[in-house]
């Protein structure tokens, strides 16, 4: 249950959180599973541990297994795992489907690609982005924080998109890339499996404590009429309306059909007055129709005044 | 929405036991650690201890350990808590409780109603 | 076993004005928690993480402190905040509470 996969390439940095999470006071012990072999805190190291954060930099193939983290609470020892795997550089141009974070899908409205796993790390804009291995250029391509915008999204937009940063760990700089497959769907009167369009899977979204913030779930159903489409928000797995919190209310949108005719729902989750524990909360935009359920979830996190990393 | 059910008072001789329910809802059980509480008439709030539901670990407090179980049957999503040896001190409004988000500890949000045990000859 | 003083045992105010209600603790803990029980209901939090408060729970509760000393604020008095407050700590099993500050409203 508390286990989560990683992955990077040899001689990138990689960082992986625990997937048990903890007060900042606690500690958080780290393992190599297969040793159980303590992790050094130590930043010399090349592989060092960081309180909720397992660090490689760089990271290697022999890397790769099962790491232990254990988030020591007043009560419970708590356990989380993280499997990693670290591969060799590819020579060529292709990204294996390993290496591959999960496919967005955009429209002509919506066109956002979220760099994965970013947040994770200390980068500093502007991020790089490559499609198919090269190198985005032309003022339709907007890098924005850690996403990017396409103008005007056409068919051919459909493909592999690379973002490239640099984290950087007491004056040292690494590499980090990460790719994941951007689809556009423009066919003739169809239904398909929902594609949600924001927010990104987990997304992190800022918010001022004591002003209202809007989520927006939007999701597109195939084109034309569709026979049954929804999009509804949850918090903490519950239903809006069985959370009991009146501070927090969604709001149905107006049903969209774009330009390419995607046939789109919104859902507008309106939080008055945001509070600290709202923070704490999971998010999900749900998005179903007769094909299934896609879920996306989002967390709050606390704006800063100065927005140095993501 | 969240709620712990109890059950209902009960009224023990000296020496006997009591075996308190809390039946969990609008929430995935196994995620949360459940507490319990108690409060003697008039007096202040004492914790007991914990249990994990997912694993059926436990955390008591020291003064209860020889005394207190704790478990979790994961098939109701409900808690026990079972007090041995009762003395007429043990007479308390007994609560489970549970923190907001868990792996925060960021106090107890969420509290059932309370069950009165009653310990007298 | 962290224990926990709270003072004043009781405090007797009138509508509208400031409450003061001090929590000491025998050893430095990172966090403190605050609960509001009125007679024959379960607590409810009121502060969590020192100074965080709970959702709905109006304004002028707010918590303050570190180490050893805690406070609980409330700016202005309403009647229906009439009602025993306890602090409790999460640093170290046991997780201790309190003894408890009455407040009365004149």
């Known amino acids: 249950k508390f286990s989560k996969q990683s992955w990077g390439l040899e001689n990138e940095a990689l960082i992986v959180r625990c997937p048990r999470q903890g007060k900042p006071s606690y500690t958080v012990d780290w393992y190599y599973s297969q040793t159980n072999k303590s992790i050094p805190t130590q930043e010399r190291n090349r592989v060092f541990a960081s309180g909720q954060l397992l660090k490689f930099l760089p990271a290697a193939v022999a890397d790769s297994g099962i790491y232990t983290c254990i988030v020591r609470s007043p009560t419970f020892n708590r356990t989380g795992y993280a499997n990693v795997t670290i591969y060799k550089k590819q020579s060529d141009c292709n990204v294996p489907d390993y290496l591959m974070y999960s496919t967005v899908s955009g429209s002509e409205k919506n066109s956002k690609i979220y760099c994965p796993t970013i947040d994770l790390y200390n980068w500093t804009a502007p991020l790089e982005w490559f499609k198919n291995c090269q190198a985005l250029q032309g003022s339709r391509y907007r890098a924005h924080k850690s996403f990017l915008v396409i103008d005007n999204v056409m068919t051919e937009d459909a493909g592999d998109y690379t973002c490239k940063f640099i984290h950087n760990e007491n004056g040292a700089n690494y590499s980090v890339t990460a790719t994941r497959s951007f689809t556009v769907k423009d066919e003739q009167g169809f239904s398909l499996f929902p594609v949600i369009g924001a927010p990104a899977q987990n997304e992190i979204k800022e918010v001022e404590i004591g002003k209202n913030a809007n989520l927006t779930c939007s999701a597109c159903f195939g084109k034309g009429t569709q026979f049954l489409a929804a999009v509804l928000w949850q918090l903490n797995g519950t239903k809006i309306t069985d959370f009991g919190e009146p501070r927090i209310q969604q709001e149905e949108g107006q049903n969209q059909s774009f330009s390419n005719g995607l046939a789109c729902l919104d859902m507008v989750l309106r939080i008055a007055d945001v509070k600290e524990e709202d923070l704490l909360l999971q998010y999900d935009c749900l998005a179903l129709n007769l094909h299934g359920l896609r879920r996306h979830t989002v967390r709050l996190s606390r704006k800063n005044p100065i927005d140095h990393h993501s | 929405q969240v709620q712990l059910v109890q059950s209902g008072a009960e009224v023990k001789k000296p020496g006997a036991s009591v075996k308190v329910s809390c039946k969990a809802s609008?929430?995935?059980?196994?995620?949360?650690?459940l507490h319990w509480v108690r409060q003697a008439p008039g007096q202040g709030l004492e914790w007991m201890g914990t249990?994990?539901?997912?694993?059926?670990?436990?955390v008591y407090n020291q003064k209860f350990k020889a005394r207190v179980t704790m478990t979790a049957d994961k098939s109701t999503s409900t808690a026990y808590m079972e007090l041995s040896s009762l003395r007429s001190e043990d007479t308390a409004v007994y609560y489970c409780?549970?923190?907001?988000?868990?792996?925060?500890?960021?106090?107890?949000?969420?509290w059932g109603q309370g069950t009165l045990v009653t310990v007298s000859s | 076993e962290i224990v926990m003083t709270q003072s004043p045992a009781t405090l007797s105010l009138s509508p509208g004005e400031r409450a003061t209600l001090s929590c000491s603790v025998s050893s430095s803990v990172s966090y403190m928690h605050w609960y509001q029980q009125k007679p024959g209901q379960a607590p409810r939090r009121l502060i969590y993480?020192?100074?965080k408060l709970a959702s709905g729970i109006p304004a002028r509760f707010s918590g303050s402190g570190s180490g050893t000393d805690y406070t609980l604020t409330i700016s202005s008095l309403e009647p229906e905040d009439a009602a025993v407050y306890y602090c409790q700590q999460w640093n170290t099993s046991p997780l201790t509470f309190g003894g408890g500050t009455k407040v009365e409203i004149k």
């Open positions: 409780t549970r923190a907001f988000y868990n792996d925060y500890d960021d106090a107890f949000a969420y």
């Open positions: 993480d020192t100074s």
């Open positions: 609008g929430y995935t059980f196994t995620d949360y650690e």
């Open positions: 249990i994990d539901p997912e694993t059926g670990d436990t």
